[in-house]
């Protein structure tokens, strides 16, 4: 698994470098997670043809994966820093159950899947420090998450491969949108 941000050899070898600002640290953390997702997607796409055929193989996707919408204030038109930050944090908290599902779904990238999960937890902490309105952030219900996890894990192999592909694709899109929005803050 890649080394988490702030622990690579370059950082150790350059003590004179200015410490990262909060925004830079968040930016770096997201890019680190995106690299991890790329590695996981590579394994998923090599293992099955889900990546090409997912559209025509599905009639409906009821996974309720977090997605950015106009009302969330994260797009250039109608940008709203506070609303957007709440959406990013809420979305990441909602993704956590899906990231838990991804554990044990990978053979050669098991550590990578764990790194993505742990780095996302760290990212949430960074963002929560940045947010002023923590009361507006709704935490997912643990009981609902537990039953969703059980349901996803009970699916057959084909559906589990499809679920894995959809989670990775959605999480990548969500993080890319978050990264663009956070760079405006």
């Amino acid at each position: 698994a890649p080394v988490p941000p702030g622990e690579d050899s370059k950082d150790v070898a350059a003590p004179h470098r200015q410490p990262l600002t909060s925004s830079e640290r968040i930016d770096k953390q997201i890019r680190y997670i995106l690299d991890g997702i790329s590695a996981l997607r590579k394994e998923t796409c090599n293992k099955s043809n889900m990546c090409e055929s997912s559209k025509e193989a599905l009639a409906e996707n009821n996974l309720n994966l977090p997605k950015m919408a106009e009302k969330d204030g994260c797009f250039q038109s109608g940008f709203n820093e506070e609303t957007c930050l709440v959406k990013i944090i809420t979305g990441l908290l909602e993704f956590e159950v899906y990231l838990e599902y991804l554990q044990n779904r990978f053979e050669s990238s098991e550590e990578q899947a764990r790194a993505v999960q742990m780095s996302t937890k760290v990212l949430i902490q960074f963002l929560q420090k940045k947010a002023k309105n923590l009361d507006a952030i709704t935490t997912p219900d643990p009981t609902t998450n537990a039953s969703l996890l059980t349901k996803l894990q009970a699916q057959n192999q084909w559906l589990q491969d499809m679920t894995t592909h959809l989670i990775l694709r959605s999480f990548k899109e969500f993080l890319q949108s978050s990264l663009r929005a956070l760079r405006q803050m």
């Epitope: 055929s53 025509e56 193989a57 599905l58 009639a59 409906e60 996707n61 009821n62 996974l63 309720n64 349901k151 996803l152 009970a154 699916q155 057959n156 084909w158 559906l159 499809m162 679920t163 959809l166």
Partner: nanobody
């Protein structure tokens, strides 16, 4: 587990209608997305139609759109396929399938439970 028994097949003329039924055992029938697939001799099993859990949404293969209608009666644990304006190319063994998943597939591997199949033959 769910057991599916499909019925209603037969030999009909082109342009005729037929209604297939699929009876399911199991108390949680309404949790399952129900689909119909068909398989003609020497061909792969192909998607025909699917209806979502509560029956709110339906999806069809392009080849049957406007001619076939899928419906379900959760009180009777049964799903139906009304087939109108039948064509010789609709000749196949029709299978009913079920899955309890947030994903509703149009691929046979997305289904866990299958009926035994009912033969539909359309003569010209």
């Amino acid at each position: 587990a769910v057991q599916l028994v499909d019925s209603g097949g037969g030999l009909v003329q082109a342009g005729d209608s037929l209604r297939l039924s699929c009876a399911a055992s199991g108390r949680t029938f309404s949790n399952y997305a129900m689909a119909w697939f068909r398989q003609a001799p020497g061909k792969e099993r192909e998607f025909v139609a699917v209806i979502s859990y509560a029956g709110g949404r339906t999806y069809y293969a392009d080849s049957v759109k406007g001619r076939f209608t899928i419906s379900r009666d959760n009180a009777k644990n049964t799903v139906y396929l009304q087939m109108n304006s039948l064509k010789p190319e609709d000749t196949a063994v029709y299978y009913c399938a079920a899955v309890d998943s947030p994903l509703i597939a149009t691929h046979p591997r997305g289904y866990d439970y299958w009926g035994q199949g009912t033969q539909v033959t359309v003569s010209s």
